[in-house]
Interface confidence: low
């Protein structure tokens, strides 16, 4: 039975040209995290494997930095970075937990962080 929950940074916004940290946290389970995938809609951004460490997709290596922790830092943001991001926790023995973050990249200097929310 999957008892864990993923807490994410929820809906967030950031300025064009800036950086943002995408964070997910898995709680309420003793399952072992074997791998975390960070995905943007139809693209794999990065993998953090328990054995192999971080692997950043070649097409994003100039703008994506691993961490902090199991999070992901996006740099040199453009308006095209607006959209859904998924943290996918592969765990044993529970299986897969997925968290969703929506990022809006703003042209203006007004960028407020949204509220946190839970995904079961």
């Amino acid at each position: 039975m999957m008892t864990g929950t993923i807490e994410t940074t929820g809906n967030i916004s950031a300025e064009k040209g800036g950086s943002i940290i995408l964070q997910c946290h898995l709680s309420s389970t003793t399952a072992q995290v074997t791998q975390v995938n960070w995905e943007q809609q139809d693209q794999l951004l990065a993998i953090c494997n328990a054995d192999l460490g971080w692997h950043i997709s070649p097409s994003f290596k100039d703008r994506v930095a691993p961490g902090p922790g199991l999070g992901l830092t996006l740099q040199s943001l453009t308006v095209n970075d607006t959209g859904e991001y998924f943290c996918i926790y592969h765990t044993y023995p529970d299986g897969t937990y997925t968290g969703r973050i929506f990022l809006e990249v703003l042209e203006s200097s007004v960028a407020e962080h949204g509220a946190r929310f839970q995904i079961p």
Epitope: T34, Q35, N37, Q41, D42, I47, D51, S57, Y92, T96
Partner: antibody, heavy 116, light 110 residues
């Protein structure tokens, strides 16, 4: 009853784009990974790629730049561009393939021959 | 990239024999491994998933074991219908992979 059925032209000319459709029934694509696999005559299984429940796609290194996998509510489509005779194979679709319970079931496969 | 190496590539056996096929992953894939059986002109059929779980409808003479990098498919008593080609497949990683399948093991009649 879970069923998968591949369809598409059996003959494609060199340099053209191979297009295949996998029509599914008995389950929802919105909660399933779907894989494409091929098998050249007399050879082993070659993984082409996979599409996730949320539309994420992952392609084999050899196919990147040439392959596109997409889906609708009941179909999964494979497009392979700039084909050569080496792309002649039986093409299969299958449910699963990534952190799942294996690829099951498989379609019956469709033979695609690349020839002028 | 994760490479899957099966051995042997082919073997000859008789009905009633115990047959063992091995699959080695180039890195730790935990228990994310499946085994398939394929007969000529047919689509592959799932036998084992998560390294050791028997798929629905598969006879109990088939069994799988292993975790990490080394895996084994065993047929305890080979039957006439078991002569086929067997493939292993890693389900651990699909990013930056060349092929998720091993090269296959053909089981022939001695």
């Amino acid at each position: 009853q879970v069923q998968l059925q591949e369809s598409g032209p059996g003959l494609v000319k060199p340099s053209e784009t191979l297009s295949l459709t996998c029509t599914v029934s008995g389950f929802s694509l919105s909660s399933s990974y779907m894989s494409w696999i091929r098998q050249p005559p007399g050879k082993g299984l070659e993984w082409i790629g996979i599409i996730g429940s949320n539309g994420n796609t992952y392609y084999a290194n050899w196919a990147k730049g040439r392959v596109t996998i997409s889906k609708t509510s009941t179909t999964v489509e494979l497009k392979l561009s700039s084909v050569t005779a080496a792309d002649t194979a039986v093409y299969y679709c299958a449910r699963g393939g990534y952190r799942t319970s294996g690829m099951d079931p498989w379609g019956q496969g469709t033979l695609v021959t690349v020839s002028s | 990239d994760i490479q899957m190496t099966q051995s042997p590539s082919s073997l000859s056996a008789s009905v009633g024999d115990r047959v063992t096929i091995t699959c080695q992953a180039s890195q730790n894939i935990y228990s994310d491994l499946a085994w398939y059986q394929q007969k000529p002109g047919k689509a592959p059929k799932l036998l084992i998933y998560r390294a050791s779980t028997l798929a629905s409808g598969v006879p109990s003479r088939f069994s799988g074991s292993g975790s990490g990098t080394d895996f084994t498919l065993t047929i305890s008593s080979l039957q006439p219908e078991d002569f086929a080609t067997y493939y292993c497949q890693q389900e651990h990683l699909v990013a930056w992979i060349y092929n998720v399948f091993g090269q296959g093991t053909k089981v022939e009649i001695k």
